[in-house]
Interface confidence: low
Amino acid sequence: FERTRSLQDPCSNCPAGTFCDNNRNQICSPCPPNSFSSAGGQRTCDICRQCKGVFRTRKECSSTSNAECDCTPGFHCLGAGCSMCEQDCKQGQELTKKGCKDCCFGTFNDQKRGICRPWTNCSLDGKSVLVNGTKERDVVCGPSPADLSPGASSVTPPAPAREPGHSPQ
């Protein structure tokens, strides 16, 4: 079947990294510089992505695969294939149209990206606040006040809500 198909369409023999050149009797020509074809049988090569400005080259373009970009330090990728770079903020901040702004009281952000989120409401789970929240950290909920009353059985300290100082990226 493959042989039959190739007799019908000589372009199907052209491997990735080449294109089927109609101007040269459908000879398989190598992709020109700064272009690529990732599959066989293509009649054109695609232009390589250029990583410019805050974009930096993570993987160089080759004749068979496009370049891949990421962002310079101080920025992080957004969108499919890192189509955008967004400015990092500090922990305890969120990015607004006017730049990085501190989280409002009662909210926190433990990452360099994303928005400020409200502190956990411990009372909803019948617990009390063991460690107060900050702009960078959520509150840590502990046993309810009743559990800590005199004469109550010994209390095991609760595990922290998240690893102290750990900011997932």
């Epitope: 930096r56 080259t57 993570r58 993987k59 990421d70 962002c71 310079t72 330090p73």
Partner: nanobody, 122 residues
Framework: EVQLVESGGGLVQPGGSLRLSCAAS????????MSWFRQAPGKGLEWVSH????????DYADSVKDRFTISRDNARNSLYLQMNSLRAEDTAVYYC???????????????WGQGTLVTVSS
């Protein structure tokens, strides 16, 4: 020990020119891509330009294209940024940085200078 030391900053009027220098030591300068970054007051870090080790590959941010020129002198272990037609919005601390080539596939800049302040004001 790797060292990068910028110089050449100062106060200049709009439309004027400055040439920044970055003196490198402690590594094989010609093996590394070098970049200029800047940080305007209260703003994030902005990439300005980079140049390959041999000087054959050069690129600029759109905001400085046709006004700034990056160059290097590998014999002198020096990186330069010629800044012409300066505008108020070019006011910033300018940093040179070395790209870490020991970590392929990353964009880490493993060594930075201390920065030099450029103020564009009348």
């Amino acid at each position: 020990e790797v060292q990068l030391v910028e110089s050449g900053g100062g106060l200049v009027q709009p439309g004027g020119s400055l040439r920044l220098s970055c003196a490198a030591s402690g590594f094989a300068f010609s093996d590394y891509y070098m970049s200029w970054f800047r940080q305007a007051p209260g703003k994030g870090l902005e990439w300005v330009s980079h140049i390959s080790g041999s000087g054959t590959t050069i690129d600029y941010a759109d905001s400085v294209k046709d006004r700034f020129t990056i160059s290097r002198d590998n014999a002198r272990n020096s990186l330069y940024l010629q800044m012409n037609s300066l505008r108020a919005e070019d006011t910033a601390v300018y940093y040179c940085a070395r790209e870490d080539i020991r970590m392929p596939g990353t964009t880490d800049f493993d060594h930075w200078g201390q920065g030099t302040l450029v103020t564009v004001s009348s």
